[in-house]
Amino acid sequence: ECVTQLLKDTCFEGGDITTVFTPSAKYCQVVCTYHPRCLLFTFTAESPSEDPTRWFTCVLKDSVTETLPRVNRTAAISGYSFKQCSHQISACNKDIYVDLDMKGINYNSSVAKSAQECQERCTDDVHCHFFTYATRQFPSLEHRNICLLKHTQTGTPTRITKLDKVVSGFSLKSCALSNLACIRDIFPNTVFADSNIDSVMAPDAFVCGRICTHHPGCLFFTFFSQEWPKESQRNLCLLKTSESGLPSTRIKKSKALSGFSLQSCRHSIPVFCHSSFYHDTDFLGEELDIVAAKSHEACQKLCTNAVRCQFFTYTPAQASCNEGKGKCYLKLSSNGSPTKILHGRGGISGYTLRLCKMDNECTTKIKPRIVGGTASVRGEWPWQVTLHTTSPTQRHLCGGSIIGNQWILTAAHCFYGVESPKILRVYSGILNQSEIKEDTSFFGVQEIIIHDQYKMAESGYDIALLKLETTVNYTDSQRPICLPSKGDRNVIYTDCWVTGWGYRKLRDKIQNTLQKAKIPLVTNEECQKRYRGHKITHKMICAGYREGGKDACKGDSGGPLSCKHNEVWHLVGITSWGEGCAQRERPGVYTNVVEYVDWILEKTQAV
């Protein structure tokens, strides 16, 4: 059962797993949610009645019954992890804590103009977990405007004390605001020879990489596969760090794989969701329960529905035993990973899907794209919306993309002459315009947010957000697309598609069925040669065939240029402008979304 409210002056008795320090009860709840075993917590706020050494303690707790006895205690705030809830969860914490000094290893000290600059520095430093900034009112003259970057083994402070005229806060890496590069490749036959900070068991290098990504101290990893010669090290995932943030030495070793934490682009990759099944593989761990199940999929469902279950092993039924049902072993461990992985015993293993909600919805795999043809099929582009105006009569105005449960990203030029959001309707999950009848459900628009530097499409800043009046319930036919990571600026996308109901040629009409076209990206240098009379800025991105023939056109504006990278779709561009449609040597020009990620997050995450 999901309990979101905090219990004031209440302490949960017993069940302690560990104690960490957090600046607020709200953040204690987030830490509990991300901890592999924590189901409940008790936080101690600052209070004259409490011993100052206990202020800001966050005690993480577990219970077989999923609850614990409650005791009244002043300044104690208790609550439950969000593991029991079905809503989306984020580790992003933008709060600034005034007059609090969050203690950790101070590894970098420099002058900063503001707390915001200090936080940005922390976000763009590979080691930084949190910071403390001494304001210009700080009593000690030589410490004024000093920005201390800090890290700890756990990612949370080792202590928190009251200190006048300082402010503290956390890195915004988990808010998708880091400019650090994301190295997504996994390097075969490679061992990174740097210091290990931890080790866990993992079934493959991808799970090892995801574990590294959400481990606070892990910057890169080495995984020994099941064919690794040393038996005791098979399936071992070594979590590593180094002073420089990069591996100092890489050694060639067969059957080992290495890679990097994807911390700074974790909003666009699955991190907690290990959805694969591992055949002929047994996961060992503490046994929670043994249940009969018809299949390994059914076993995974049982594990997902049992809040304490972290992983499972299913042993298929022997011929006619037990009505064809096999045994489903529900398991857990102290760190959420199997304590040992065995092969060749006939089991099928996997992980709970309960933690998938801790990943961005946009990372969910969608149904395979239909290759060939120009007409889309239902569910192929579930982020694509059709934006209608009702004035003077109802018609398709522009495309747009779902990027959050209340947000559509589109082009600013779509709103020329639109006086009020009241005349707009957003339809999602639509394949054919003919599906839209008077009684078709739509989302009303609460607010149109146009970039304040927008003047006209050709001069850039052609980007706008629509805030919906109600939230979108994600389904197979309507779900968000990931924003590109700032750390992926150097990625060369090779699988890009433009979609929309726009014209198929310059003099045409809006199409009934959603059209799609695969279009290669063109360098800005090349694009500039094709548009001598315009300035193609780095905030624009171009796509098109040299010979023309495929392009976006009138009515496609505001729609997505979607590119698939590492199995995840990213909103790389917004259809903006071009000379004619599909003309030879006239690529389409799109708003380069990666350059507006800060702007999008600022507007959509505003309190």
Epitope: A181, I183, N189, T249, I251, K252, S254, N490
Partner: antibody
Framework: EVQLLESGGGLVQPGGSLRLSCAAS????????MHWVRQAPGKGLEWVSS????????DYADSVKGRFTISRDNSKNTLYLQMNSLRAEDTAVYYC??????????????WGQGTMVTVSS | DIQMTQSPLSLSASVGDRVTITCRAS??????LNWYQQKPGKAPKLLIY???SLQSGVPSRFSGSGSGTDFTLTISSLQPEDFATYYC??????????FGQGTKVEI
């Protein structure tokens, strides 16, 4: 034809700076690790620096660390080496080289023709 | 860092001779060893990678062998165009990528 073409070498005074470029053609540049290797007159080959395909990972020989910076622009198919605080011992022919596909051929399979850098007062 | 030691540093041979150059690593490098040929005023050219794999376009008279610490480059029948300097290089533990001092094959 697959090729690498270096430019930017020349005569420079000690303490001075120089920027070398290496233009790649005939292959898709972006997936490959790229390297700079130098050869002092009459001497053997010395590895200088390397850069990962997307540019987020660089390595340097101890002899140039803190003075040289490797970078790349995948949209221009070009590799760079910014050399600052140059010393007489940096005098050499500088080659750019492509590292072959990981796991199959990790050797430097394509080399440029080299560009001469002379550091002298 | 892994040190690479070549021997001999120079050798004289005639056309048609069988020539052997050895390279020793200061520690085991498995089979991650490459051989390059360099002619005066030219860039090095890859001959052999992974100790014994012949790079495409390289004549079959060139061959490589060895693993661990000791490696050999053999030219079965020396041709006029083979007079050059030969370098071994390890790619086992990097950075740095280290080269041998070179072996000059003279007429």
């Amino acid at each position: 034809e697959v090729q690498l073409l270096e430019s930017g070498g020349g005569l420079v005074q000690p303490g001075g700076s120089l920027r070398l470029s290496c233009a790649a053609s005939g292959f898709t540049f972006s997936p490959y690790w790229m390297h700079w290797v130098r050869q002092a007159p009459g001497k053997g080959l010395e590895w200088v620096s390397s850069i990962y395909s997307s540019g987020g990972w660089t390595d340097y020989a101890d002899s140039v660390k803190g003075r040289f910076t490797i970078s790349r622009d995948n949209s221009k198919n070009t590799l760079y080496l910014q050399m600052n605080s140059l010393r007489a011992e940096d005098t050499a022919v500088y080659y750019c080289a492509r590292e072959g596909v990981a796991g199959t051929n990790d050797a430097f399979d394509i080399w440029g023709q080299g560009t001469m850098v002379t550091v002298s007062s | 860092d892994i040190q690479m030691t070549q021997s001999p540093l120079s050798l004289s041979a005639s056309v048609g001779d069988r020539v052997t150059i050895t390279c020793r690593a200061s520690q085991s490098i498995s089979s991650y060893l490459n051989w390059y040929q360099q002619k005066p005023g030219k860039a090095p050219k890859l001959l052999i990678y992974a100790a014994s794999s012949l790079q495409s376009g390289v004549p079959s008279r060139f061959s490589g062998s060895g693993s661990g610490t000791d490696f050999t480059l053999t030219i079965s029948s020396l041709q006029p165009e083979d007079f050059a300097t030969y370098y071994c290089q390890q790619s086992y533990s990097t950075p740095p990528w280290t080269f041998g001092q070179g072996t000059k094959v003279e007429i």
